[in-house]
C-alpha cells in the first residue's frame, strides 16, 4: 500500500513538475525590466526564450519572436536545449510511469517489469528536473552578469546634458516557475526510485533444490516446468532448468542493481 502511494505521489508530483517546466519554457517573462532605482518609464520590457515583449502603460503589448538562430547568444541556445531535453525526458518518463503504476493493471505484466519501468521513469524525472534547474540557473547567471555590467555603465554621458539610459533586466516569473517545477520533477523522480525498491520481489534466487547444512530444510519448488511457459496462475514459480538463468520476474532477486540506487 505504501509502495503504491509513494509511486502514485511520485507520478503526480512529477506530472505537476513537468507541466511547470513546459509552462516555464513557454513563458515570456524569463527576464523583466528592473524597476528598482531606475527612471520610471511608461513602457515595460520583458523577455522569454523565444520572444521579447513590450507592454505600454495603456495595456498594449507587442511581442517579437527571435527569428534567428545564428544571431542568438550561445547561452540562450544552451538554455533552450536544456529545457527541451528536460521536457522530452519528462514526457517519456510520464509515459513509462503510467504503465508502471501499480494501481493500473496491463495484461499480465510482472511486478518486476513494473519495478524496472518505475526505476526508468524515476531516473528520467531526475534528469529532467536537473535539466530544468540547470537551464534556469544558467539563464539566471547570465542575467546577474548582464545586470552588473549594465549597472556599471547605466548612465553614459553623450555630449553634455544628453544621456542614454540602459535597460536593466532582472529575474522574471518564469525562472521561479522553472526552479520550483524542476525541483518537483526531481522529487517525483526520487519518489519513483524509492517506490521501485518496494515493488521489487525480495525473494532469494532459488535453484531447483537447495541443500542446507542442517539437513532438514530442503526447499523444493514444485511446478517449475509448468511455470516456464509464463502463462497460467502460478506465474511466480521459477524455472528449474538452466541453473542461473532467471525469468523476468526474477530480475529483482538479490543481488540486484536496484539495491544500489
Amino acid at each position: 500500500m505504501a509502495v503504491t502511494a509513494c509511486q502514485g505521489l511520485g507520478f503526480v508530483v512529477s506530472l505537476i513538475g513537468i507541466a511547470g517546466i513546459i509552462a516555464a519554457t513557454c513563458m515570456d517573462q524569463w527576464s523583466t525590466q528592473d524597476l528598482y532605482n531606475n527612471p520610471v518609464t511608461a513602457v515595460f520590457n520583458y523577455q522569454g526564450l523565444w520572444r521579447s515583449c513590450v507592454r505600454e502603460s495603456s495595456g498594449f503589448t507587442e511581442c517579437r519572436g527571435y527569428f534567428t538562430l545564428l544571431g542568438l547568444p550561445a547561452m540562450l541556445q544552451a538554455v533552450r536545449a536544456l529545457m527541451i531535453v528536460g521536457i522530452v525526458l519528462g514526457a517519456i518518463g510520464l509515459l513509462v510511469s503510467i504503465f508502471a503504476l501499480k494501481c493500473i493493471r496491463i495484461g499480465s505484466m510482472e511486478d518486476s517489469a513494473k519495478a524496472n519501468m518505475t526505476l526508468t521513469s524515476g531516473i528520467m524525472f531526475i534528469v529532467s528536473g536537473l535539466c530544468a534547474i540547470a537551464g534556469v540557473s544558467v539563464f539566471a547567471n547570465m542575467l546577474v552578469t548582464n545586470f552588473w555590467m549594465s549597472t556599471a555603465n547605466m548612465y553614459t554621458g553623450m555630449g553634455g546634458m544628453v544621456q542614454t539610459v540602459q535597460t536593466r533586466y532582472t529575474f522574471g516569473a518564469a525562472l521561479f516557475v522553472g526552479w520550483v517545477a524542476g525541483g518537483l520533477t526531481l522529487i517525483g523522480g526520487v519518489m519513483m526510485c524509492i517506490a521501485c525498491r518496494g515493488l521489487a520481489p525480495e525473494e532469494t534466487n532459488y535453484k531447483a533444490v537447495s541443500y542446507h547444512a542442517s539437513g532438514h530444510s530442503v526447499a523444493y519448488k514444485p511446478g517449475g516446468f509448468k511455470a516456464s511457459t509464463g502463462f497460467g496462475s502460478n506465474t511466480k514459480n521459477k524455472k528449474i532448468y538452466d541453473g542461473g538463468a532467471r525469468t523476468e520476474d526474477e530480475v529483482q532477486s538479490y543481488p540486484s542493481k536496484h539495491d544500489y540506487v
Epitope: 527612471p39 511608461a42 520590457n45 513590450v54 502603460s57 495603456s58 495595456g59 544628453v162 535597460t167
Partner: antibody
C-alpha cells in the same frame, strides 16, 4: 463617439481647493487611461497626471503633493483634486484619453478654466 | 525630469513649402525592447485643444494628412510638413511619452509667410 467633458473650473482664492471632473463617454475608464494636462494663458502645455486603466497613477513631480487624480468607474468620470492652489495654477485644464498605442493622447476635452486669484 | 527642447520658437513658411520643426530630449526616448521611440507630436490651433498627429516618433495617427511626417531617433526628432496648407497654421508640440512625468516641448508657432 468618444467624448470628454470637463467641469468644476472657476475662480478660486489662493490656498483654496477645487475638484475638477471629466465625464467620459464612448469608452470605459477601465479600458483606457486618462490624463490631465494644463495650459496657462498664452503658454505651452504642461502634463499634470494620469490614471491608467488598471488604476495605477503617475504625477508631475512638481504637483504631486497638492494634486490627486481619481475616478469613479460606475459614473465613468475622472477627477482631479487640487489643494493649496496658487496663482501659477491658473490655467485651462484638459482631460485627454490615452491612446492604446504609443502612449499618446488621442482624444481631448474642450478644457475648463481655473483662475486662482484674490 | 526629461527636458524637451523645441526649435525654432516660431516659423514662417510660404504656402506649399516645406516646414521643419525640431525637438530634442535630454535623454533617449528609444526603447531597446521594441526599438520604438516614444515621442509624440501634437497640433494645437487657436482656441482648440491639442490634436494628436504622430506617435512612436514616425507613425501617423489615423485621419492625419500624409503631408505630416515624423522622423528621428534617440534624442533628436523632426516634424515635417511637406507642403504647407493654410489650415496648418497652429502651434506644434512634441512630447516625451517614455519617462514619467510626461513632458512637453515649449511649442513651435507655425505661420504663413
Amino acid at each position: 463617439e468618444v467624448q470628454l467633458v470637463e467641469s468644476g473650473g472657476g475662480l478660486i482664492q489662493p490656498g483654496g481647493s477645487l475638484r475638477l471632473s471629466c465625464a467620459a463617454s464612448g469608452f470605459s475608464l477601465t479600458t483606457y487611461g486618462v490624463h490631465w494636462v494644463r495650459q496657462a494663458p498664452g503658454k505651452g502645455l504642461e502634463w499634470v497626471s494620469v490614471i491608467w486603466a488598471g488604476g495605477s497613477t503617475n504625477y508631475n513631480s512638481a504637483l504631486m503633493s497638492r494634486f490627486t487624480i481619481s475616478r469613479d468607474n460606475s459614473k465613468n468620470t475622472l477627477y482631479l483634486q487640487m489643494n493649496s492652489l496658487r496663482a501659477e495654477d491658473t490655467a485651462v485644464y484638459y482631460c485627454a484619453r490615452a491612446a492604446y498605442y504609443g502612449n499618446g493622447l488621442d482624444y481631448w476635452g474642450q478644457g475648463t478654466l481655473v483662475t486662482v486669484s484674490s | 525630469d526629461i527636458v524637451m527642447t523645441q526649435s525654432p520658437d516660431s516659423l514662417a513658411v510660404s504656402l506649399g513649402e516645406r516646414a521643419t520643426i525640431n525637438c530634442k530630449s535630454s535623454q533617449t526616448l528609444l526603447n531597446s525592447g521594441n526599438q520604438k521611440n516614444y515621442l509624440t507630436w501634437y497640433q494645437q490651433k487657436p482656441g482648440q485643444p491639442p490634436k494628436l498627429l504622430i506617435y512612436w516618433a514616425s507613425t501617423g495617427e489615423s485621419g492625419v494628412p500624409d503631408r505630416f511626417s515624423g522622423s528621428g531617433s534617440g534624442t533628436d526628432f523632426t516634424l515635417t510638413i511637406s507642403s504647407l496648407q493654410a489650415e496648418d497654421v497652429a502651434v506644434y508640440y512634441c512630447q516625451n511619452a517614455y519617462f514619467y512625468p510626461f513632458t512637453f516641448g515649449g511649442g513651435t508657432k507655425l505661420e504663413i509667410k
